[in-house]
Amino acid sequence: AWELTILHTNDVHSRLEQTSEDSSKCVNASRCMGGVARLFTKVQQIRRAEPNVLLLDAGDQYQGTIWFTVYKGAEVAHFMNALRYDAMALGNHEFDNGVEGLIEPLLKEAKFPILSANIKAKGPLASQISGLYLPYKVLPVGDEVVGIVGYTSKETPFLSNPGTNLVFEDEITALQPEVDKLKTLNVNKIIALGHSGFEMDKLIAQKVRGVDVVVGGHSNTFLYTGNPPSKEVPAGKYPFIVTSDDGRKVPVVQAYAFGKYLGYLKIEFDERGNVISSHGNPILLNSSIPEDPSIKADINKWRIKLDNYSTQELGKTIVYLDGSSQSCRFRECNMGNLICDAMINNNLRHTDEMFWNHVSMCILNGGGIRSPIDERNNGTITWENLAAVLPFGGTFDLVQLKGSTLKKAFEHSVHRYGQSTGEFLQVGGIHVVYDLSRKPGDRVVKLDVLCTKCRVPSYDPLKMDEVYKVILPNFLANGGDGFQMIKDELLRHDSGDQDINVVSTYISKMKVIYPAVEGRIKFSTGSH
């Protein structure tokens, strides 16, 4: 038998420095977790102790903190090279800065193969990107070889900016011929490494003949066998075993997100490349693991530019940006409008001639807006200012919800109106009218939403049975501020871009902003 140790990360999202337990900014270092310096310590420890080790990443290194905003992927290549990753799969966020923003900082600089079998380049891009990412790679490990085949969410055109010259094929359809090719090359140990979410990971394990192990990402799935070491609740055992259509037991793993854990899977293969056994668990990268001093010193060196960036002007406002709780938790506030407009702007994807855009709606809990910005400081808006408005390091995500769920969410928005609670919703692409004289749960008297399948956008009444796309903070998608109905009833959830980055990009693009209060949220009494 031959034993392989697979170390894996996914959805690191720019968490190069250690973070707090909830993956936000590290405040108390003695209780912080993750970061590449700590990850390196653990990886090196395992490499020294075990003979056949692969370090893999399942995508979405890009996007999530000021590190990505400033360095635009150069930081990913540099520190993944330093950690000596063996392979990476492309995630949807790797396309956030367009194809050029992937090619230059990452594909050209990585000293490891970057993989995706279901992304096919066409037109002028085909020759430009040829060889810079691969469908699969055969890696020598000890005296054996292991085939790694990559895949990426086919929803990427709706989630990021891959442009028109990349075609995202069905994962299973694209993977099978590549796996077959590996088999003809006498590679009998094959790992599918990719970024399409846990449900697709399980389908790949079930349907793609010849795949021995699936290492996934995108859904931030936490798997664990036994007593979990932190706050994350396991979605299943680690590894999650899927019985393939041809009767094999295929281990499927994922390692939550944000570099908080290092996935650790030990696989035993027989001489014909069949998996005999698999076991392991994600390793919590807490402060009991020291940060590697040389990587830490490198991080500190790279940090200097970030500190300078946060005080530079992004754009100007010529109006007061009212992000006060007195406004944003009680009525439409122009800071809420600004943020929602930025959220929609960040998700403009003209992927279908029938639609002016795939999404038109935004909701945002007023309690998530933590500060105003005064225009009397020469109108200057900096990253630092925005960090005071949006201090939680969240993301603005894309969900699909039924109209009935949205109606419940808006009822929840005002179910205890007047107590300065955070659940009061700010909106974009929505006109809502509340009647507070009615009883809680029956206060939404009008709810109109901006059409998407139209050439001239206009507001139509919400249809209860229709499925709508909505941009919202990950906090709401996860049921925060009591929006349990969103968490329980959402039909799809894709994580998006860092909140501050979305707003800063919008302000930089607009240069001068003047958001108004314009009647998105209204109150009526009695007859309407």
Partner: antibody
Amino acid sequence: QVQLVQSGAEVKKPGASVKVSCKASGYTFTSYWMHWVRQAPGQRLEWMGNINPSNGGTKYNEKFQGRVTITVDTSASTAYMELSSLRSEDTAVYYCARRDYGSPSYWGQGTTVTVSS
Amino acid sequence: DIQMTQSPSSLSASVGDRVTITCRASQDINSYLTWFQQKPGKAPKSLIYRTNILLDGVPSRFSGSGSGTDFTLTISSLQPEDFATYYCLQYHEFPVTFGGGTKLEIK
């Protein structure tokens, strides 16, 4: 297949400059960095610098800083290395090499430069 | 700059022999080491990058191992076309630096 064809041998006087070309074929020129390396008689190989053909970004060995200039003509899929203020110790074979995964991987056939008064 | 020390500087062997060449870096270069072959009057030909990954078309009798500061190139069964000079280079950090070479001759 990847081919890097370099210009012919040069004989130069001390103090002069030399410009060596490297024409790439068999791949998309702008997609890969190009290294320049030299091999002087009886000396170990020396890395001179590299260039990103898509944006002209360069990195140079400090030993040659100020004397070496690496450029590209993307329309001709050609990289150039110019070395100025030549001295006798610059007599060497100069190679271009395509960079893959960080490393020089595919090499040109070499250009002999002789510096002699 | 990182110094690369190769040993031996020359060695004699016969067809079918197993041959090992070593390369030592003056500091940790992770796994970012390339081995290449050069025949007299010819361009270098890269064989292995990142310590142990063979470039396309390189015969499987060539293999590499090591990490950190100590690295090895092994030719499991020498063929007549393998007699040449072998070099290592590190690309962990700039400037890229080279070993002094190992001349492999027919015994």
